[in-house]
Amino acid sequence: WELTILHTNDVHSRLEQTSEDSSKCVNASRCMGGVARLFTKVQQIRRAEPNVLLLDAGDQYQGTIWFTVYKGAEVAHFMNALRYDAMALGNHEFDNGVEGLIEPLLKEAKFPILSANIKAKGPLASQISGLYLPYKVLPVGDEVVGIVGYTSKETPFLSNPGTNLVFEDEITALQPEVDKLKTLNVNKIIALGHSGFEMDKLIAQKVRGVDVVVGGHSNTFLYTGNPPSKEVPAGKYPFIVTSDDGRKVPVVQAYAFGKYLGYLKIEFDERGNVISSHGNPILLNSSIPEDPSIKADINKWRIKLDNYSTQELGKTIVYLDGSSQSCRFRECNMGNLICDAMINNNLRHTDEMFWNHVSMCILNGGGIRSPIDERNNGTITWENLAAVLPFGGTFDLVQLKGSTLKKAFEHSVHRYGQSTGEFLQVGGIHVVYDLSRKPGDRVVKLDVLCTKCRVPSYDPLKMDEVYKVILPNFLANGGDGFQMIKDELLRHDSGDQDINVVSTYISKMKVIYPAVEGRIKFS
Amino acid sequence: WELTILHTNDVHSRLEQTSEDSSKCVNASRCMGGVARLFTKVQQIRRAEPNVLLLDAGDQYQGTIWFTVYKGAEVAHFMNALRYDAMALGNHEFDNGVEGLIEPLLKEAKFPILSANIKAKGPLASQISGLYLPYKVLPVGDEVVGIVGYTSKETPFLSNPGTNLVFEDEITALQPEVDKLKTLNVNKIIALGHSGFEMDKLIAQKVRGVDVVVGGHSNTFLYTGNPPSKEVPAGKYPFIVTSDDGRKVPVVQAYAFGKYLGYLKIEFDERGNVISSHGNPILLNSSIPEDPSIKADINKWRIKLDNYSTQELGKTIVYLDGSSQSCRFRECNMGNLICDAMINNNLRHTDEMFWNHVSMCILNGGGIRSPIDERNNGTITWENLAAVLPFGGTFDLVQLKGSTLKKAFEHSVHRYGQSTGEFLQVGGIHVVYDLSRKPGDRVVKLDVLCTKCRVPSYDPLKMDEVYKVILPNFLANGGDGFQMIKDELLRHDSGDQDINVVSTYISKMKVIYPAVEGRIKFS
């Protein structure tokens, strides 16, 4: 019996087609992805093949103005239109709190939403009961397939799930649910979830009875053969893990941003064992037309976005200096504003010993693309912020050793004075440079805001200590020459859309007046 | 024809009786003021004398939890109960914006509310039309008396009147209104207003046709004879000004906080000339009983206040270190929080050349009386803040020379190490002390945040420049040994209630996490 698994993950609000790098579509003839194009491909496969499941491994939420404005209603609407068969909860599904998951998505989705390792307690338990499930048994043709969900255990540090959801260890939580499915005579089981490729592989290895793992969170691109675009495969598709009980378990993920549709064909024997598996992600490029009716619906929904982007988010009473002349040479107040917003967006007071899990921000000055003039009645709009941060990036959470951070700050000024983008703007960091010293030895003071303290204050950076830092995904991926970050990072979790982070902060603050306050000094 | 003028000014939300220093009443047998006691005295005088006017010269708004909770409704209600005959608008009447004046007070007051030098424009002009007046002619016995109002021209810098009210020069605006009254055959004219004693005297001198000036704003205490409490008279009551056209014009003011009832008897001839004037403020001490019916009404209104003071205003995720061990010795995050709130409360971006009219805050560490523990679910209540700031003070605006500020910072550490209260917490200031140097010469660096700039940044203090600073009224009055501030200040405007400033900021911010960030350093 043959099953076709179509899968997406980490779509992050890319409802419209995008450029090849998943930023805003500029030249339509070269654009990719988007729900209208995905619909075309999914329907094509459904018409051609008998047993098809369309699955999403989480993080539909967060990533473009679509999420900012529609807050998840757009996810439910278009996933319903695509007739997804199941979805796993990702960490970003909690970005607007549990209410922001329940109302727009859980209550509106016509497909099951899954996570076996999230347990509700207190008053939430009854409120959320039945709105998400640990597993779901789906009829496919004449057979049944069990789908069991999982979500990153780190979600409380990455999003806003509140205090009434407990995130358990994935493997510990999955095993009893899979066992239950077995007792229900379900012999074909897919683990669908959002904990990253390493955990996906562990699940394949450790959870008895899981036949296939469909993952997300780490934006992993797998491919067999010559890859069709710029993504470099982390392994073959599917990635085969030998389980502890000797089975060959295919593990898949489909990069991110709706650029690819994962396509996996599995052959099962009559006892539900996987006999063979093959496939590849399908690049959703312009050779696949966008379905015009879905496109028309997208265009209807777009209207509200265009209105939103010119509305006032808040006011500034100071010039927000995002000029290259400032931000690539010295502390600039636009950099301070953005870093302050990045920290504010990552407040997770989950432990009495730590006032917060993260206190530091770094931001390449070259990533700040425009100032904002306060003389337009102080008004700041989404449109203004999109000029400052035009690349559609995210502000991510990484873990780095102090020594890596020191290297990063040396890199920040290794060729100072040439208006290059690597000069770092900061938050929760006080740095002093001595430019008379040779490159690689110019950082003479580097103090960082403590986290394991009840009153935040600045202490000297310790080389061997592991620190959490918020930074643009561009830097996490080694951009602007920050190879040491990419090479040495100990953990990397994708965060919220850059503009959304700053816009939320400005809306919250109502009136802003960031200063140049001595975070960066030259001795 | 004899007229009795009863007058109050700068009552600042003291609806209940207070201690002698106008803070919260502790020992009722020694308490003073409050509307129930005022009612008793006013009614007594009304019964005894034929021609009585009860006037208020502005700043009923702002000062205690009464205003925080009731937002002006309490002012209208109890002033109506006292049957005030007229009120002038003070700067604080605009603290909640024009809407916060119109709805609770202007629309509800049963007495005229006056200001001749405030002109509405744009959409507000029709909305506010008739709700306040430049003048009002009041019948008193068989005569008529004209009352013409005025308000500090500085209100846009002191409060939140918005962009659709123009504050004109008082004298320029008053003269045509007085002339108009004269053409209406009104020959007894009182100028009732809120611009401070210096302006009151100027009005008496310059505005032809004004017979009496009843003022406010500067909390001026005038008295003839031996003063009955702690206030030291600034002059005799009434203070007589000789006008440019040779008339003797009595000028009065009645301190503040409802502690006194101004009592002025004027004798007019048949042409409306002042023949004589005499009187004194009446100390509303416990020898005057509180009216039991008004008291009962006060107690009914109180219930909501008690509920409010235990409700969550916002959250802290850090320990708010308001301990003496910290705030009297070094930068403390409670000091930073309070100073940040003080600046935030004084944002008035009225000029393109200045991002704000004020950027600096100083706060005596000894005025911070308690920490707030974050381990109570982070909750911050009014009750918590009242423990931090228990003295019922205000955060005022002063103008000082740089040299005065330098002296203040030297005083801050002149006897460092003895846990004395004069150690300054700051905002918009970076100070470096060298304690190895002799007292009076310990400030080695004093940088202040520019105001006449579009991007706020720190520049060295200039000795001869005039700076605006926000500070506690306690310091403006020379408390904690800051005699240099009291002696050398160039201007002093009373501000908002201390707790209200901090509570508003916390409510706005929702979650706070002030750090110790290097505002105060020791070299």
């Epitope: 239109a81 037309p289 015009p292 009716s293 879905i294 028309a296 | -």
Partner: antibody, heavy 121, light 111 residues
Framework: EVQLKESGAELVKPGASVKISCKAT????????IEWVKQRPGRGLEWIGE????????NYNEKFKGKATITADTSSNTAYMQLSSLTTEDSAIYYC??????????????WGQGTSVTVSS | DIVMTQSPASLAVSLGQRATISCKAS??????????MNWYQQKPGQPPKLLIH???NLESGIPARFSGSGSGTDFTLNIHPVEEEDAAVYFC?????????FGEGTKLEIK
């Protein structure tokens, strides 16, 4: 065999509403869009709107917004179109059609027999 | 909206001859090498019937005497040789974008 069977002719009074149906057989109902088209006697074809059964997605010709409401019931594989506030201008034959995909150029490959609606007092 | 202009409004063609109907779109209906133009035939008392999709692709069961051509904005339906049963009204329709729009129709009579 793909078939679309529409409900019978309707004679209705001005100001009233009418709801016509279109039952689909021979294919997966939720897999294809259902289109509605108006044809007045001796006139051309006017597209009214469409629905993707099983979803909330409908698209309408601006001209028919407020006039037509398209719904679908996946349990009975039936699409519906309600026409409200009828006038004589609404007298026409109304067709439902199945819309194909990119491989058939998004053309309307199967049509119902049409429902005649006559508005007359 | 894309406006479809069909010509002629009617034409009479002798049996065995060629009938040519034109359709012009107000903007291109091409996408990635495909033209989203369809042709329908409608006989009296019957619903329209799809003849050609994507400008030139004949529906199964439709005789080969029907052919379509064109790209961009200009399209043609050819019938050759015309037979008696081809008397009908022919409509073009663009399916590039919603709202779908039809031509006004061309009435073909057989002489």
């Amino acid at each position: 065999e793909v078939q679309l069977k529409e409900s019978g002719a309707e004679l209705v009074k001005p100001g009233a509403s009418v709801k016509i149906s279109c039952k689909a057989t021979g294919y997966t109902f939720t897999g294809y869009w259902i289109e509605w088209v108006k044809q007045r006697p001796g006139r051309g074809l006017e597209w009214i709107g469409e629905i993707l059964p099983g979803s909330d997605i409908t698209n309408y010709n601006e001209k028919f917004k407020g006039k037509a409401t398209i719904t679908a019931d996946t349990s009975s594989n039936t699409a519906y179109m309600q026409l409200s506030s009828l006038t004589t201008e609404d007298s026409a034959i109304y067709y439902c059609a199945r819309r194909g995909y990119d491989e058939t150029g998004y053309a309307m490959d199967y049509w119902g027999q049409g429902t005649s609606v006559t508005v007359s007092s | 909206d894309i406006v479809m202009t069909q010509s002629p409004a009617s034409l009479a063609v002798s049996l065995g001859q060629r009938a040519t109907i034109s359709c012009k779109a107000s903007q291109s209906v091409d996408y990635d090498g495909d033209s989203y133009m369809n042709w329908y035939q409608q006989k009296p008392g019957q619903p329209p019937k799809l003849l050609i999709h994507a400008a030139s692709n004949l529906e199964s069961g439709i005789p080969a005497r029907f052919s379509g051509s064109g790209s961009g904005t200009d399209f043609t339906l050819n019938i050759h040789p015309v037979e008696e049963e081809d008397a009908a009204v022919y409509f073009c329709q663009q399916s590039k974008e919603v709202p779908w729009t039809f031509g006004e129709g061309t009435k073909l009579e057989i002489k």
